[in-house]
């Protein structure tokens, strides 16, 4: 039995997968912030997690996925104000009783030290210093991401 949030996450991911393939992104668009091989957009308004997920999708991006502790720290370094919380693309899957990224993978327990409960209708936010479990209905800011395409040297066959 999937929760409405899980369904929403799956639907959006599937619709993203169906969209026409676009050319790779070589540079971050204006208004987006480059962090290594990603472009990030920090929202200015607040929304529950579901709406944040949908907003990123309309921007042809996804809620932020964090690979490891190092990426978390680099992202947190961009946040100037200690009091501001941002949704990322991680929520509690009731069916699997585990934290699940919106790309379908599960959280490696060593990656993030989450403050708060792992329970139904819990979604993950980050601040300048911490990672929190919040009710998904809480209205806070969010971070969208786009992956930059690595530039590979083209190899031409001998003429």
């Amino acid at each position: 039995q999937k929760s409405s949030i899980e369904k929403c996450s799956v639907d959006i991911q599937q619709s993203r997968n169906k969209t026409t393939e676009r050319p790779g992104l070589l540079n971050c668009p204006i208004y987006w912030q480059q962090l290594r091989e990603k472009c990030l957009l920090f929202s200015h308004t607040v929304n529950p997690w579901n709406n944040s997920l949908a907003d990123c999708s309309t921007k042809e991006s996804s809620l932020l996925l964090i690979r490891d502790k190092d990426e978390l720290i680099h992202t947190q370094n961009l946040i100037r104000d200690k009091a501001i919380l941002f949704w990322i693309g991680l929520n509690f899957s009731l069916s699997e009783k585990n934290w699940k990224w919106i790309n379908g993978s599960f959280l490696n327990s060593n990656d993030l030290e989450i403050r708060g409960d792992a329970k139904e209708n819990s979604c993950i936010s980050i601040s300048q210093t911490s990672v929190y479990s919040e009710y998904c209905s809480t209205e806070i800011r969010w971070i969208c991401q786009k992956e930059l395409t690595p530039v590979r040297n083209k190899v031409y066959p001998d003429s």
Epitope: R22, L25, P29, I30, Y31, Q33, L41, F42, H44, T45, T58, K59, E60, S61, L78, I79, R80, D81, I84, K146
Partner: antibody, heavy 116, light 111 residues
Amino acid sequence: QVQLQESGPGLVKPSETLSLTCTVSGGSINSYYWSWIRQPPGKGLEWIGYIYYIGSTNYNPSLKSRVTISMDTSKNQFSLKLSSVTAADTAVYYCARDRMGALDYWGQGTLVTVSS
Amino acid sequence: DIVMTQTPLSSPVTLGQPASISCRSSQSLVHSDGNTYLTWLQQRPGQPPRLLIYEISNRFSGVPDRFSGSGAGTDFTLKISRVEVEDVGVYYCMQAAQFPTFGQGTKLEIK
């Protein structure tokens, strides 16, 4: 209602640095982008650059080597520095709030004259 | 740079009559996030610019409904259904698909 007010010297000598501050009231600079735009007398508008509320900046490539925009969240202010000025930098300088291309609130503007 | 070209540069209009300003960009203004960041600004004499329309056709709060925006890709239009005295000034289109650039301005005056 968000209000912006530019302040700084109205006269700058050639080769010196122009420094302006924009004070924001009626809202926090902990959201949105905050831009500087200028308008030479009798001419059109030119975007100088913005600072993002997380602190990162983006500048007009033609001015990039001379421009620095910074912010002071404790004072709800952001500032412009333009180095090595010439007479061509004489303009009315505006600060504005930028919602991804929608410059929705503007200061009244301040005329900066570059002259010895 | 994206070059924004406005026509006409001057537009004498009779009070109560419609007015139309065209803006053409040197390349598509569709941002990589799917939105089109095309804005219209009004600058009355001696005043700072004022936001009228954003993202092609969205009227900013407090802007009278006689102002409307349309277009797509590289061609955009600002229409005033019935010109009033307070509409006199210079109108600028602006793009923010890349670093922002403005059109050269269209001066609206009363005949």
